[in-house]
Interface confidence: medium
C-alpha cells in the first residue's frame, strides 16, 4: 500500500511539473501549443492562484478576529496574601507581597481590604483563611469566615460563609476554611473577606489568601 501511495505521489508531482512547464511554454508563445489549450491552462492556473489568495485573506481575517477577541477578553486574575493588622475591624487585610498575582489594572486591591473589578462578567472568587483558636479563650460562637460583595449602588451581601468550632488544643488549634464559587460581578464591584476574630488568623506563608479569576 505504501509503495502504491508513493507511486501516486510521484505521479501527481510529475503532473504538476508538466502543468507548470506548459504554462511557461504558453507564456513564451511556443508554436507547438494551440491557443485554445493555452487559454484553458491559464484560466485553470488563475483559478488556483485566486483560491490560494482567498485562503490567505480568510486566515488573516481569522487571526485579526482572534486578536480582537483577545483584546475584548484579557485575562483578569488576582491572588493576594494576608497581612496582620492592628485595626479591630473584622474585614481581613491583604497585600501584594510574596507570590501574589495582579494580572492588570482591570482588577485592583483597594485599601488593602477589597478586590475591585472593572469589567462585568462571571468570576471564580475564592478565599482561604487559616486560624488558630482555643475553646476556653474564645466566645461560644464558632469562628466564621464570610466572602462578601459590594456592588455600586447596592447593599453589601454575603456570597459564601463557613463556620468552624474552636479547638481544645493549647495554646490554640489550627484549622483552615476554604471558600470558593462562581459569581456575576458588575463593573466597580468589590469583594472582601470578613471573620469573627481577626486576631486568630494565621498570617504565615501560604496559610491565608484571597483571589479571583474572570472566566
Amino acid at each position: 500500500h505504501r509503495r502504491l501511495d508513493k507511486i501516486e505521489d510521484e505521479r501527481n508531482l510529475h503532473e504538476d511539473f508538466v502543468f507548470m512547464k506548459t504554462i511557461q511554454r504558453c507564456n513564451t508563445g511556443e508554436r507547438s501549443l494551440s491557443l485554445l489549450n493555452c487559454e484553458e491552462i491559464k484560466s485553470q492556473f488563475e483559478g488556483f492562484v485566486k483560491d490560494i489568495m482567498l485562503n490567505k485573506e480568510e486566515t488573516k481575517k481569522e487571526n485579526s478576529f482572534e486578536m480582537q477577541k483577545g483584546d475584548q477578553n484579557p485575562q483578569i486574575a488576582a491572588h493576594v496574601i494576608s497581612e496582620a493588622s492592628s485595626k479591630t475591624t473584622s474585614v481581613l487585610q491583604w497585600a501584594e507581597k510574596g507570590y501574589y498575582t495582579m494580572s492588570n489594572n482591570l482588577v485592583t486591591l483597594e485599601n488593602g481590604k477589597q478586590l475591585t473589578v472593572k469589567r462585568q462578567g462571571l468570576y471564580y472568587i475564592y478565599a482561604q483563611v487559616t486560624f488558630c483558636s482555643n475553646r476556653e479563650a474564645s466566645s461560644q460562637a464558632p469562628f466564621i469566615a464570610s466572602l462578601c460583595l459590594k456592588s455600586p449602588g447596592r447593599f453589601e451581601r454575603i456570597l459564601l460563609r463557613a463556620a468552624n468550632t474552636h479547638s481544645s488544643a493549647k495554646p490554640c488549634g489550627q484549622q483552615s476554611i476554604h471558600l470558593g464559587g462562581v459569581f456575576e460581578l458588575q463593573p466597580g464591584a468589590s469583594v472582601f473577606v470578613n471573620v469573627t476574630d481577626p486576631s486568630q488568623v494565621s498570617h504565615g506563608t501560604g496559610f491565608t489568601s484571597f483571589g479571583l479569576l474572570k472566566l
Epitope: A84, A169, S202, T205
Partner: nanobody, 123 residues
C-alpha cells in the same frame, strides 16, 4: 528583613532563675501573637508558652505552669520569658517564634523565629 534575636540564656543551678528576651525587627511585632518553644538535646520541639498580640491572653505548657511567665512590650518590640524554679529538664535551646500555630511543631512551620538561646540547668 525579619529578625528575632533571643538572649539571656546561660548556665544556672536547679531552683535558679533566668529571664529570656527576644528582640524583634523587620515586621510589625505588635500585630502578632508570639510564643516560646524549646528543643532539649536530642529531642523534638516543645511548645512552652504563648501570648496574644496585645499581651492580655497567655498560655503555658503543663510542664512550666506556675514557674514561667511570658510577657511582651510592644513599644520595645520585645518578648520576654521569666523562668523561675528551674529544673534539669528545662535544659534546652529556647526559641521565640510567631504564635498563630497549634501545639505540635517542626521548625519549617514558623515564618518568624530566631536562632535560639541555650539554657543549661545543672549543679
Amino acid at each position: 528583613e525579619v529578625q528575632l534575636l533571643e538572649s539571656g540564656g546561660g548556665l544556672v543551678q536547679p531552683g535558679g532563675s533566668l529571664r529570656l528576651s527576644c528582640a524583634a525587627s523587620g515586621f510589625t511585632f505588635a500585630f502578632y501573637p508570639m510564643m516560646w518553644v524549646r528543643q532539649a538535646p536530642g529531642k523534638g520541639l516543645e511548645w512552652v508558652s504563648w501570648i496574644d498580640a496585645t499581651g492580655t491572653r497567655t498560655y503555658y505548657a503543663d510542664s512550666v505552669k506556675g514557674r514561667f511567665t511570658i510577657s511582651r512590650d510592644n513599644s520595645k518590640n520585645t518578648l520576654y520569658l521569666q523562668m523561675n524554679s528551674l529544673r534539669a529538664e528545662d535544659t534546652a535551646v529556647y526559641y521565640c517564634a510567631e504564635g498563630n500555630y497549634g501545639s505540635s511543631y517542626t521548625m519549617g512551620v514558623f515564618d518568624y523565629w530566631g536562632q535560639g538561646t541555650l539554657v543549661t540547668v545543672s549543679s
